[in-house]
């Protein structure tokens, strides 16, 4: 006899990186017929919801209207059908950004390189932090972690046209509190036409949408959304 229900999916909208004082919604998708959902924060019950009518709803949204460092951390959710509870979801790391200062991002040898050249990004922040994060915008976003007293370097190695795109970096005061994002650096990698057609640039956002850290402007694919978050967040652990 089954003792627990399958774990729900958890993700944040518009993104798991939330500028301070902005709003974020934590979504928990379980099963139709679930009579109760619980959201746990750092191991303690944070919010409860009983969707109505349960047979027509398989997802609840927990709303955080005003993000701050107190709300940043690890969230998980569970749901109940009758008296049977689900396994807990994967952990969602909710990060507060726009804390304190803005780092500077630079690239060596420069923003325009030839395929095969070695490229290194440098993220610098003169305040008390020793961990830095480099993010590439786009659907298949990559997050890299680096360490250093005031600067971290991120060697990309010999680049290909797949490395083209817009990069930003953050200083991290702890796993869940990050600085303002740096100004963007757009990396242009030139290669032969055949390579370029095989490795199109990741879709990037218009500059104004980056402020809300949207993953993509038109994804309805919540599980893809959750999968991206999960991939990026593995670097936080």
């Amino acid at each position: 006899q089954q003792q627990t229900l399958p774990k729900p999916f958890i993700w944040a909208e518009p993104h798991f990186m939330v500028p301070k004082e902005k709003q974020v919604t934590i979504c928990c998708q379980g099963n139709y017929g679930a009579v109760e959902y619980q959201l746990h924060f750092e191991g303690s019950l944070f919010a409860v919801d009983r969707p109505k009518p349960p047979e027509r709803i398989n997802k609840v949204q927990f709303y955080i209207p005003d993000m701050n460092s107190r709300m940043a951390g690890q969230y998980s959710c569970i749901y109940r059908v009758g008296e049977l509870w689900s396994e807990p979801s994967n952990l969602l790391d909710l990060v507060v950004t726009e804390m304190y200062d803005t780092p500077t991002l630079s690239v060596h040898p420069g923003p325009e390189v030839i395929s095969g050249e070695k490229v290194t990004f440098y993220c610098r922040l003169d305040t008390a932090t020793s961990m830095f994060l480099l993010l590439k915008e786009g659907r298949s976003s990559h997050v890299q972690r680096g360490y250093g007293k005031v600067q971290a370097e991120f060697p990309l190695g010999p680049v290909t046209t797949a490395h083209r795109g817009t990069y930003r970096c953050f200083g991290s005061y702890n796993n869940h509190a990050w600085s303002f994002p740096s100004e963007p650096v757009k990396l242009l990698v030139t290669g032969d036409i055949e390579n370029t057609s095989l490795a199109p640039e990741d879709p990037t956002f218009p500059a104004d949408t980056w402020g809300t850290y949207l993953l993509t402007t038109e994804t309805g694919l919540q599980k893809d959304h959750a999968l991206w978050d999960h991939t990026a967040q593995n670097l936080l652990r």
Epitope: Y37, L39, F46, A47, D49, R50, V60, Q61, F62
Partner: nanobody
Framework: DVQLVESGGGSVQAGGSLRLSCAAS????????MGWFRQFPGKERERVAL????????FYADFVEGRFTISLDNAKNTLSLQMNSLKPEDTAMYYC??????????????????????WGQGTQVTVSS
């Protein structure tokens, strides 16, 4: 501005009953959460029972074990907590609180006290053995 005024506290023997009331005024939102929290000396406030006006949907702490019932009289804007089978360990200061719902649908409630922006002054409940 939102005002919450509790009443109904007092002293009672173990096994007895009390009914706490909280008169609410000034809340403009259609959906919101109200709750009863309690505080022991030197400790943080802990949730006792919550109710969401959109349901209304009720949520209880495990220690309540069916002994307490939270209810809301919308016509009178009064929140109540009927406490039966009281135990000496229920002795505490009881507070009424109000805050936003945890979802846009209005059917959920936050649990931590810091998510509630309006508080009453508290009413003391003392249960003697």
């Amino acid at each position: 501005d939102v005002q919450l005024v509790e009443s109904g506290g007092g002293s009672v023997q173990a096994g007895g009953s009390l009914r706490l009331s909280c008169a609410a005024s000034g809340y403009r939102s259609r959906h919101y959460c109200m709750g009863w929290f309690r505080q022991f000396p030197g400790k943080e406030r802990e949730r006792v029972a919550l109710i969401n006006t959109g349901g209304p949907t009720t949520f209880y702490a495990d220690f309540v074990e069916g002994r307490f019932t939270i209810s809301l009289d919308n016509a009178k804007n009064t929140l109540s907590l009927q406490m039966n089978s009281l135990k000496p360990e229920d002795t505490a200061m009881y507070y009424c609180a109000a805050g936003p719902p945890s979802s846009d649908s209005g059917s959920g409630c936050y649990v931590p006290e810091y998510m509630y922006n309006y508080w009453g002054q508290g009413t003391q409940v003392t249960v003697s053995s």
